[in-house]
C-alpha cells in the first residue's frame, strides 16, 4: 500500500482552478526526492505533466505549478483554466512515475451549471458588492419592480419598490430606479455571503405583460494564497480590499477552531498577545490597501490567515476578505539569535543581529518597536552614521563580527529602555529579527566615574574598573561617534580595589588624554570583548574647560556621583529628525534561540524562542 495520500476525486467546472494537495511521509529522502503529477493513459503508462524538477508539459504551460512543502510532507499542484479535456485519471507521486510511490486522483471537469436563456452571470467575491441590472419597457415604468431568488422550485421575494426587504438582506440591499430617461432598475447587494449565490429573477410589473430578466449570482470564496516562510523569518501579508472599504476598520485574523478567526491585529488597536513586539500594521493607502508584517516566525504561527474589513474590526459574515495559508519551514536558513537580552540600570547590552551574509553591503538598522495604535518602529541608529539624538553617546551599531552578524551596543540603561527592538537591513526582508531588552535588578559590572571635566592643555586620566570575571577578556577604551567607537590607547594599572571579594584578576585600565584639546570633548566608552564579539560597556562624558590651575587631572571613582537615570545630554547636541520605518521592506523580525558562545556575563544574552531560559547582561 502506497504511503502517499490525497484527494481521490476532484470535481470542478470549466474555467476554474484546482489546488491538489498530496501528502507524503516527511522522511529526509522523501522531502528531497522528485515530486510529480502525471496523467494515466489507457495502456497503463503515466505521462508527466509537471514535476518539482522544473518540467512543465506544453499542456500545462502558463497555467500550472507544483510547490513542495518539505517540512509539512506535502506538495501542491495548482492547475488553472480548466477545460473538460482535463478530465481524467492522474497520479501524484514521488520518485519515478512507475515506482508505485503514488496516489490515484480522478479529476472531473464539467461544463458548469446550465443557465436559462438570456441569463446574465454575475461573479463576485465574498463580502463585495454586486449590482444586478434589470431592464424594463415603457409600459411597466410606473409598475412595481421586484427581485426574486429561486429557492428550490419557488421564487422568494428579496426586495421590491414598495419597500419590502427580505430579512436575510436587511441593511445590505437597495433597489435603485434610474432617471426617467433610462428604462432600467438596479438592485445593489453589499457584503455578499456565500448563501446569496443562486438564480435570481428581476421583474417589472406583475401581470402577463411584465418584463423579466434572469440573473445567476456566483459568490466566490477567496482561494488561500500559499505562503512559505522560514522559521525565525518574517512574512508580509499585503491586503487589498478595494476603495469601497477604505474607511472601514481593517483586521488580520488567524483561523483557529471551527468558525473562529482570532484577531491578530486590527486598526482599532487590538493586537493578540502572542504577537507583541513582532507585528506591525502598515498604514493603509487611500485605496484601503494595507499590509501586516509579522517577524520572528514560530512553528505555531503556521495556519490560515484572513484579512478583511468590518466596522467591528473582526471577521463577520459578509466581510470582504483575502486569505493566506502560511507554512513555516523549520529547516530555516535564518540562524538562531538571542530573543531576550537582560541588562541592569546603568549597565549595557550588546545585541547580535543576523543578516543575509550575501548582503554584507546592505544598510543595517535598529529600531524600537512601539505598540501604540497599529505599531510602528522608529529608527534609532543605522550603519551609515545616523543616530537618533536622544541616543547619542550611548548607542552604536558595529559591522562586527561581520559575515552575517552585526552588533548593536546600548549603554547607560534605564528602565525606559525595556522593550522590543528590531534588527533589519534594506536588503532581504526575511532577515528581520526581534530582541526584547529587559531591565533587571543589579549593579553594572564595569565601574567608571560619572562626571569628568578635563582642562585644556592638561593631561586627563580616566579609570575603568573591570571585575575578575572579565580576566580573560580584551579590555578597551574608545571614543564614541556616530559611526562607531574608535579605539584609543589605554594602560593596565594592575588589580582594582573597587571590588569586594575579587582577587588579583580584577583590573584597573585607564584612558589617558595628553594635552587636552576641545576636540577631546565627548563620550568615551570602556568595555570588554572577545575577538569581534562585544560584551559590556560603560560610558563617561568628558567635558573640556579652560585652564584654572596647573597640573594634570586624575579622576577617581569618588566623583562618579551621577545616577544613571540623571544623565542628560547637553542641549547643544544637534537634533536629528525622528526617522520612523514606513517602507514595509524595512520592517523587522523575530524571536530566536540560544547562542552557544557563553560570553562574559552574557550581555549578549543567550536565549530561547520562548524566552524560557534568558541570559542576562551586566548583572552576574
Amino acid at each position: 500500500k502506497s504511503p502517499i495520500f490525497g484527494p481521490e476525486e476532484v470535481n470542478s467546472v470549466e474555467g476554474n482552478s484546482v489546488s491538489i494537495t498530496c501528502y507524503y511521509p516527511p522522511t529526509s529522502v522523501n522531502r528531497h526526492t522528485r515530486k510529480y503529477w502525471c496523467r494515466q493513459g489507457a495502456r497503463g503508462g503515466c505521462i508527466t505533466l509537471i514535476s518539482s524538477e522544473g518540467y512543465v508539459s506544453s499542456k500545462y504551460a502558463g497555467r500550472a505549478n507544483l510547490t513542495n512543502f518539505p517540512e509539512n510532507g506535502t506538495f501542491v499542484v495548482n492547475i488553472a483554466q480548466l477545460s473538460q479535456d482535463d478530465s481524467g485519471r492522474y497520479k501524484c507521486g514521488l520518485g519515478i512515475n512507475s515506482r508505485g510511490l503514488s496516489f490515484d486522483v480522478s479529476l472531473e471537469v464539467s461544463q458548469g451549471p446550465g443557465l436559462l436563456n438570456d441569463t446574465k452571470v454575475y461573479t463576485v467575491d465574498l463580502g463585495r458588492t454586486v449590482t444586478i441590472n434589470c431592464p424594463f419597457k415603457t409600459e411597466n415604468a410606473q409598475k412595481r419592480k421586484s427581485l426574486y431568488k429561486q429557492i428550490g422550485l419557488y421564487p422568494v421575494l428579496v426586495i421590491d419598490s414598495s419597500g419590502y426587504v427580505n430579512p436575510n438582506y436587511t441593511g445590505r440591499i437597495r433597489l435603485d430606479i434610474q432617471g426617467t430617461g433610462q428604462l432600467l432598475f438596479s438592485v445593489v447587494i453589499n457584503q455578499l455571503r456565500l448563501s446569496d449565490a443562486g438564480q435570481y429573477l428581476c421583474q417589472a410589473g406583475d401581470d402577463s405583460n411584465s418584463n423579466k430578466k434572469n440573473a445567476d449570482l456566483q459568490v466566490l470564496k477567496p482561494e488561500p494564497e500559499l505562503v512559505y516562510e522560514d522559521l525565525r523569518g518574517s512574512v508580509t501579508f499585503h491586503c487589498a480590499l478595494g476603495p469601497e472599504v477604505a474607511n472601514v476598520a481593517k483586521f488580520l485574523c488567524r483561523q483557529s477552531s471551527g468558525e473562529n478567526c482570532d484577531v491578530v491585529v486590527n486598526t482599532l488597536g487590538k493586537r493578540a498577545p502572542a504577537f507583541e513586539g513582532r507585528i506591525l500594521l502598515n498604514p493603509q493607502d487611500k485605496d484601503g490597501s494595507f499590509s501586516v508584517v509579522i517577524t520572528g516566525l514560530r512553528k505555531e504561527d503556521a495556519g490560515r490567515y484572513l484579512c478583511g474589513a468590518h466596522s467591528d474590526g473582526q471577521l463577520q459574515e459578509g466581510s470582504p476578505i483575502q486569505a493566506w495559508q502560511l507554512f513555516v519551514n523549520e529547516e530555516s536558513t535564518i540562524p538562531r539569535s538571542p530573543t531576550v537580552v537582560k541588562g541592569v540600570a546603568g549597565g549595557s547590552v550588546a545585541v547580535l543581529c543576523p543578516y543575509n551574509r550575501k548582503e554584507s553591503k546592505s544598510i543595517k538598522y535598529w529600531c524600537l518597536w512601539e505598540g501604540a495604535q497599529n505599531g510602528r518602529c522608529p529608527l534609532l541608529v543605522d550603519s551609515e552614521g545616523w543616530v537618533k539624538a536622544q541616543y547619542e553617546g550611548r548607542l552604536s551599531l558595529l559591522e562586527e563580527p561581520g559575515n552575517g552578524t552585526f552588533t548593536v551596543i546600548l549603554n547607560q540603561l534605564t528602565s525606559r529602555d525595556a522593550g522590543f527592538y528590531w534588527c533589519l537591513t534594506n536588503g532581504d526582508t526575511l532577515w528581520r529579527t526581534t530582541v526584547e531588552i529587559k531591565i533587571i535588578e543589579g549593579e553594572p559590572n564595569l565601574k567608571v566615574p560619572g562626571n569628568v571635566t578635563a582642562v585644556l592643555g592638561e593631561t586627563l586620566k580616566v579609570p575603568c574598573h573591570f571585575p575578575c570575571k572579565f580576566s580573560s577578556y580584551e579590555k578597551y577604551w574608545c571614543k564614541w561617534n556616530n559611526t562607531g567607537c574608535q579605539a584609543l590607547p589605554s594602560q593596565d594599572e594592575g588589580p582594582s580595589k573597587a571590588f569586594v571579594n575579587c582577587d588579583e584578576n580584577s583590573r584597573l585600565v585607564s584612558l589617558t588624554l595628553n594635552l587636552v584639546t576641545r576636540a577631546d570633548e565627548g563620550w568615551y566608552w570602556c568595555g570588554v570583548k572577545q575577538g569581534h564579539f562585544y560584551g559590556e560597556t560603560a560610558a563617561v562624558y568628558v567635558a573640556v574647560e579652560e585652564r584654572k590651575a596647573a597640573g594634570s587631572r586624575d579622576v577617581s571613582l569618588a566623583k562618579a556621583d551621577a545616577a544613571p537615570d540623571e544623565k542628560v545630554l547637553d542641549s547643544g547636541f544637534r537634533e536629528i529628525e525622528n526617522k520612523a520605518i514606513q517602507d514595509p521592506r524595512l520592517f523587522a523580525e523575530e524571536k530566536a534561540v540560544a547562542d552557544t558562545r557563553d560570553q562574559a556575563d552574557g550581555s549578549r544574552a543567550s536565549v530561547d524562542s520562548g524566552s524560557s531560559e534568558e541570559q542576562g547582561g551586566s548583572s552576574r
Partner: nanobody
Framework: EVQVVESGGGLVQAGGSLKLACAAP????????MGWFRQAPGQEREFVAA???????????YYADSVKGRSTISRDNAKNTVYLQMNSLKPEDTAVYYC?????????????????WGQGTQVTVSS
C-alpha cells in the same frame, strides 16, 4: 457554540446500504472541510472520508482505504449538510460514525485538526 448533528445510522444487513447525513446549520463560509470518522468498540477513532469545497464550484473528496470504492461523500452547501453513502456494507463497518468540521486544510485524516464534532450515529452491520 457551533454544532453538527449526525443522522441516518441504524441496523443493516451485510451487503446493504446506508446514507448518513450531517447537518451543520451554524457553519458558514469558513467551513472548508467536512469529515466522517468512525469508532468501533475498543478501537481508536479512524478517518473514513472528507470533502472540501472551495466556494468556487470545486470539490475535493478523500477516502480511507477501508471504504474506497464502497462509499461516496457529498455535500449540499445550500443545506449545510454533508452525506456519506455507504454501499456493500461489511460487519467490520460496525461503529459509531462521527461527523466533524474544520477550517484547517492540513491532512484530512488527522483527527485533532477537526475542531467541531457531532455526538455520533450508530451503524450496525449484521452478518
Amino acid at each position: 457554540e457551533v454544532q453538527v448533528v449526525e443522522s441516518g445510522g441504524g441496523l443493516v444487513q451485510a451487503g446493504g446500504s446506508l446514507k448518513l447525513a450531517c447537518a451543520a446549520p451554524g457553519l458558514t463560509f469558513s467551513s472548508y472541510r467536512m469529515g466522517w470518522f468512525r469508532q468501533a468498540p475498543g478501537q481508536e477513532r479512524e478517518f473514513v472520508a472528507a470533502i472540501d469545497w472551495n466556494g468556487r464550484g470545486t470539490y475535493y473528496r478523500y477516502y480511507a482505504d477501508s471504504v474506497k470504492g464502497r462509499s461516496t461523500i457529498s455535500r449540499d452547501n445550500a443545506k449545510n449538510t454533508v452525506y456519506l453513502q455507504m454501499n456493500s456494507l461489511k460487519p467490520e463497518d460496525t461503529a459509531v460514525y462521527y461527523c466533524a468540521a474544520t477550517t484547517v486544510l492540513t491532512d484530512p485524516r488527522v483527527l485533532n485538526e477537526y475542531a467541531t464534532w457531532g455526538q455520533g450515529t450508530q451503524v450496525t452491520v449484521s452478518s
